[in-house]
């Protein structure tokens, strides 16, 4: 099976114990590294930060002691914005300066692949966004030709059934990606106003439409029926909940919220907490199991996080071995305990050892 | 073997102008970002500018900002510093050096530039 | 801008020695920062980076260590040809700055 893990080039910015730099990574956790993200400048694939060519180099420093590991470097992004992708996705001149750059820059840089974040097409990009990876593809085997290794290239999909129908044509992009990052989780935010475990495994109880969709179990089936072979197919799992500020003395699942909660400590994003610093809310807090969705959350006083245990990934990684998927994708690698000093296990990377034990258990 | 050669040195007036460049070899020149670094007479190192390898964005030292310029040519393997409105405080020998990220890996021998009346 | 103060400005040292060389930001640079060694008339080489790596070809007696605002470099024991001045740098953000510099020599 492979085991996908993201790296975010902006976790080295976290203060103190926080901070997570490449070298801080285990070589032999997971199968593939993807670093996030690439910007794309002129055209060409280029460095977000200056000083990422530095953490590229730390990184891929890592297959020197396993040649097995495979590295790729992510594209795109949230801040990149799908405006950008578009325009250049677009224009067949733009996507051929833009493909033609690529393979040069991830051979100078160590990597063994790129892959696509394009968050997300629209409903007019869907076509372009065929093109372009249909000519990626075709870039990568040509430049392979002198008897390099390929080049591999994947792609991180949203598990939305909206942005499904409206941004991909499955069937046509799987034909070209070695696989397919479905990311099964940002399900349910404080958008709702409502507490709500942000990746359940399976449709909660009092889920009606459009919640019947929001869950891996719909999102990957989803993905099958429209022509994903299970074989290129990696499902996401979060080493991050998501936090709401509850709006009454109700605590459970579907209560009333004010908006997301509070920021972490290290993380400093309302609404979202890395397992690390969930570990330390958890003492003096309450954890409760959704029974159904096998799912855990944890409250404390207004605070209400929804996330994922060893517990949960087992069953996750159970689900994917069931459904013959290709493996698991992890984000972020970075945001699991990667010191072990915050879980209490003495134990680095506590959730994604978890995955990868439960992946080859047999 | 990486080889950066800088050339375009000499002596100028103050207000004058002064393009320095400098021809690379030895690695792909649009995939790393290239510095300019200076050392004025037994003085210290002073970054002057850099500039990404796509050419996308370029960064300056307050001192020279709004007077030197950083370009880069990919075809052509080159890099260069447009100094305008030079001072008697510009005088240094001008090291163009290849940036790994945040540190500079490779350094060129320096062209001297000398502002003087 | 972000200060690099070197200590001390100069030092002697005799062949054998354990030199320690620090640094210090004028605010957190994480591990951004870098060690350079430059002999007269040359063009100055890289030692270190990020802190602690050891660049390519340099010599193992060259260490560095730190972060956030407090950097050494520490040369185990001293070489005949380790007499030179040495800049750290920080590349945490632009712009970059290096230290005054520390110059090594021959007691």
């Known amino acids: 099976y492979k085991l996908v893990c993201y790296y975010t080039s902006w976790s080295q910015y976290r203060e103190g114990d926080g901070s997570c730099f490449p070298d801080a990574l285990d070589r032999f956790l997971c199968t593939h590294i993807i670093y996030s993200f690439a910007n794309i400048s002129n055209d060409h694939i280029d460095t977000w930060e200056w000083n990422d060519v530095t953490l590229y180099g730390m990184l891929n420093t890592l297959k020197n002691r396993n040649p097995n590991l495979k590295t790729l470097l992510s594209v795109g992004g949230w801040n990149f914005g799908s405006q950008r992708f578009s325009k250049i996705a677009s224009n067949t001149q733009s996507r051929r300066t833009f493909i033609k750059s690529v393979p040069p820059f991830l051979r100078t840089h160590g990597f063994d692949g790129l892959d696509l974040a394009w968050l997300y097409p629209g409903r007019r990009d869907k076509q372009h966004f065929t093109t372009l990876i249909k000519e990626m593809k075709a870039e990568f085997i040509k430049e392979a030709q002198p008897g390099k290794k390929q080049l591999l290239l994947s792609a991180a999909l949203s598990a939305g059934k909206v942005t499904i129908d409206s941004s991909y044509d499955i069937a046509k992009i799987s034909q070209h990606l070695d696989f397919i990052s479905i990311m099964t989780y940002d399900f349910h935010g404080a958008w709702r106003g409502t507490t709500g475990h942000h990746s359940p495994l399976f449709r909660g109880q009092e889920d009606a439409s459009p919640d019947r969709f929001s869950n891996t179990d719909y999102a990957v089936g989803y993905m099958l029926r429209l022509g994903a072979p299970a074989s290129k197919l990696v499902m996401g799992i979060p080493t991050f909940g998501r936090s709401f500020t509850l709006a009454s003395s109700e605590t459970g699942v579907g209560a009333p919220i004010s908006g997301p909660g509070i920021p972490g400590r290290f993380t400093k994003e309302a609404g979202t907490l890395a397992y690390y610093e969930i570990c330390d809310f958890l003492r003096g807090a309450t954890v409760h199991r959704i029974l159904g969705q096998q799912v855990p959350y944890a409250t404390k006083g207004n605070q209400w996080v929804g996330y994922d245990d060893q517990e949960s990934v087992k069953s996750k990684v159970q689900y994917l071995k069931d459904r013959q998927l290709a493996g698991a994708m992890v984000w972020a690698l970075d945001l699991d305990d990667f010191q072990g000093s915050f879980c209490g296990q003495d134990l680095r990377f506590p959730l994604t050892n978890a995955i990868k034990d439960a992946l080859a258990a047999t | 073997e990486v080889q950066l050669v800088e050339s375009g040195g000499g002596l100028v007036q103050p207000g004058g102008s002064l393009r320095l460049s400098c021809a690379a070899s030895g690695f792909t020149f649009s995939s790393y970002g290239m510095s300019w670094v200076r050392q004025a007479p037994g003085k210290g190192l002073e970054w002057v500018s850099a500039i990404k390898g796509s050419g996308g964005s370029t960064y300056y030292a307050d001192s020279v900002k709004g007077r030197f310029t950083i370009s880069r040519d990919n075809s052509k393997n080159t890099l260069y510093l447009q100094m305008n409105s030079l001072r008697a405080e510009d005088t240094a020998v001008y090291y163009c050096?290849?940036?790994?990220?945040?540190?500079?890996?490779?350094w060129g021998q320096g062209t001297l530039v000398t502002v003087s009346s | 801008d972000i200060q690099m103060t070197q200590s001390p400005s100069s030092l002697s040292a005799s062949v054998g020695d354990r030199v320690t060389i620090t640094c210090r930001a004028s605010?957190?640079?994480?591990?951004?920062l870098n060690w350079y060694q430059q002999k007269p008339g040359k063009a100055p080489k890289l030692l270190i980076y990020a802190t602690s790596t050891l660049q390519s070809g340099v010599p193992s007696r060259f260490s560095g260590s730190g972060s956030g605002t407090d950097f050494t470099l520490t040369i185990s024991s001293l070489q005949p040809e380790d007499f030179a001045t040495y800049y750290c740098q920080q590349s945490y953000s632009f712009p970059w700055t290096f230290g005054q510099g520390t110059k090594v020599e021959i007691k």
């Open positions: 605010q957190s640079i994480s591990r951004w």
């Open positions: 050096a290849k940036t790994y990220g945040g540190e500079i890996d490779y």
